[in-house]
Amino acid sequence: HTAAQDNCTCPTNKMTVCSPDGPGGRCQCRALGSGVAVDCSTLTSECLLLKARMSAPKNARTLVRPNEHALVDNDGLYDPDCDPEGRFKARQCNQTSVCWCVNSVGVRRTDKGDLSLRCDELVRTHHILIDLRHRPTAGAFNHSDLDAELRRLFRERYRLHPKFVAAVHYEQPTIQIELRQNTSQKAAGDVDIGDAAYYFERDVKGESLFQGRGGLDLRVRGEPLQVERTLIYYLDEIPPKFSMKR
């Protein structure tokens, strides 16, 4: 895949190694940790990003911070198994043979078990609710301006078509962005809502995954929108299977 032509870097993923060894001497980039070739015109899958993040040397892992708001059942970061397309494998296990099932965004959706645990299919996360609290401003943002700006941001920065931004709700200082995407709705080249949400989350935390691009500078009619808290809720096409003791 072609990356940036002039200096052979990957604009959409700084956690890559790039070299001009593609067809015809074109720039090709591979994700750290997995060595999988990535398409630098679009977002890299969250699974490959998480794998790259875990492979980085501890002292060089400038992108990693304690993730106080991550809704991953407090499991935190883990080194995932990805399929050849870069998607999470339905079953994930750690080095101590503890296994669990995940959804398409890599969030655990069952109790933990042993190697005998079966995860029949990768269950799709079809609805993501991004809950933001913005810092105090002189007045509330205009709702329609905020809606338009967030749709533009998700299209231009994360390449997510506005059809997948189902709604933007606003009650100062809380903003809720609803992303919806069924398996059947994804057409060729469409970005996955899970990947868009992950890139957005990292941007909001000041841990941008983009190469050489400035951090997230979100403005609504020139007024800076600064996020001070993020919570992300994931809804799967099939409800999760946790025991009652949870």
Partner: antibody, heavy 119, light 108 residues
Framework: QVQLVQSGAEVKKPGASVKVSCKAS????????MHWVRQAPGQGLEWMGE????????SYNQKFKGRVTITRDTSTSTAYMELSSLRSEDTAVYYC????????????WGQGTLVTVSS | DIQMTQSPSSLSASVGDRVTITCRAS??????LNWYQQKPGKAPKLLIY???RLESGVPSRFSGSGSGTDFTLTISSLQPEDFATYFC??????????FGQGTKLEIK
């Protein structure tokens, strides 16, 4: 091989509506965006709108102010573009084109349908 | 809407010439720029997508470059079948997606 075959030329009177069809073959119809682009005689290309055949979602060029409607019939792998309240400046060749969700590039085009608006 | 401006509007060249057509966007469009070739009475044909990626089956004499607002389409050695009209198109932002006005390449 991928093919987009459009309906034949139309002559319409001002104020009337026209519905152009585009039958797709050679690929999974619901897996690609379908766009409509028009070209007035001797002029450039103008994007009119798009649809995802999987769920009938459409978005449109606001220039057409609600005059354009794009639909599809998945059972026949056919997309349709209807333009209402026709005026003489709508005389153009209308193309359907298969699109890519990320690049928004149009890799296969129909042969075009000439719509003439004349009283 | 993003405006796309091509230059020149027309140009004359000979077989074997190296030809460059430029396209300028009214705002940053990253690399989401596509090029098409159209011959009289025919539908446009995709040549290059995402600034520099050659569409399958397109001869390697066609190449594209640029980023941000300024882009170029280069034909390294003109062939008789290359005389046509060329359009650029952006796919960066929210709809509508917009085209340049076209560059007509004629035989000198």
């Amino acid at each position: 091989q991928v093919q987009l075959v459009q309906s034949g030329a139309e002559v319409k009177k001002p104020g009337a509506s026209v519905k152009v069809s585009c039958k797709a073959s050679g690929y999974t119809f619901t897996s690609y965006w379908m766009h409509w682009v028009r070209q007035a005689p001797g002029q450039g290309l103008e994007w009119m709108g798009e649809i995802t055949p999987s769920d009938n979602y459409g978005s449109y060029n606001q220039k057409f102010k609600g005059r354009v409607t794009i639909t599809r019939d998945t059972s026949t792998s056919t997309a349709y573009m209807e333009l209402s309240s026709l005026r003489s400046e709508d005389t153009a060749v209308y193309y359907c084109a298969r699109g890519h969700g990320n690049y928004v590039s149009f890799d296969y085009w129909g042969q075009g349908t000439l719509v003439t608006v004349s009283s | 809407d993003i405006q796309m401006t091509q230059s020149p509007s027309s140009l004359s060249a000979s077989v074997g010439d190296r030809v460059t057509i430029t396209c300028r966007a009214s705002q940053d469009i990253s690399n989401y720029l596509n090029w098409y070739q159209q011959k009289p009475g025919k539908a446009p044909k995709l040549l290059i997508y995402y600034t520099s990626r050659l569409e399958s089956g397109v001869p390697s004499r066609f190449s594209g470059s640029g980023s941000g607002t300024d882009f170029t389409l280069t034909i390294s050695s003109l062939q008789p079948e290359d005389f046509a009209t060329y359009f650029c198109q952006q796919g960066y932002t929210l709809p509508p997606y917009t085209f340049g006005q076209g560059t007509k390449l004629e035989i000198k």
